[in-house]
Interface confidence: low
Amino acid sequence: MMTGTIETTGNISAEKGGSIILQCHLSSTTAQVTQVNWEQQDQLLAICNADLGWHISPSFKDRVAPGPGLGLTLQSLTVNDTGEYFCIYHTYPDGTYTGRIFLEVLESSVAEHGARFQIP
């Protein structure tokens, strides 16, 4: 039975050229996390594996930094970065937990950072 809950930074906005931190947190379960995948729509951004550590996809290695913790820092944001991001927790014995974050990258200098932890 899957008892865990994913908390995420929810819907966030940031300025073009800036950076943003994507955060997920898995709670309410004693399951062992074996790997966390970060994905943007259908593209793999990064993997954090319990044995192998971090792997950043080659196409993102110049703009994605691991951390803090299991989070992901996106740098040099462009409008094309707008969209859905997913943190996928692979756990044993529970299985897979997925959290969703929507990022909007704005041209304006008045982008509000609405980052907050939300329980979907």
Epitope: H25, S27, V33, A50, L70
Partner: nanobody, 118 residues
Framework: EVQLVESGGGLVQAGGSLRLSCAAS????????MGWFRQAPGKEREFVGA????????YYADSVKGRFTISADNAKNTVYLQMNSLKPEDTAVYYC???????????WGQGTQVTVSS
């Protein structure tokens, strides 16, 4: 498990400064990151920033970047959150959090209240 005790909260006027401290004890050798989060009345918990315990690399939410600074004193197992140019919207309970090995969750402190009056 890591035990965390925050201190330094209080009431301050807008534009003022506060320094929060977080003392860690217990399984401190497992810590990879120390973070600060906050929760304003009626809102969800929000990531403020974090510091890598070993490299001392820091990360900040855009809402506090340039105003808040996180530092660590490894000898004292303590992490600090220096908050400058405080705004009324910074009013919240501030929580210290520690993250263990590469795939661990956060351990939480009890929180300390920060109130910024206009």
């Amino acid at each position: 498990e890591v035990q965390l005790v925050e201190s330094g909260g209080g009431l301050v006027q807008a534009g003022g400064s506060l320094r929060l401290s977080c003392a860690a004890s217990g399984s401190i050798f497992s810590i990879s990151d120390m973070g600060w989060f906050r929760q304003a009345p009626g809102k969800e918990r929000e990531f403020v920033g974090a510091i890598n315990w070993l490299s001392e690399s820091t990360y900040y939410a855009d809402s506090v970047k340039g105003r808040f600074t996180i530092s660590a004193d490894n000898a004292k197992n303590t992490v600090y959150l220096q908050m400058n140019s405080l705004k009324p919207e910074d009013t919240a309970v501030y929580y210290c959090a520690a993250q263990g090995g590469v795939l661990s969750g956060w351990d939480w402190g009890q929180g300390t209240q920060v109130t910024v009056s206009s």
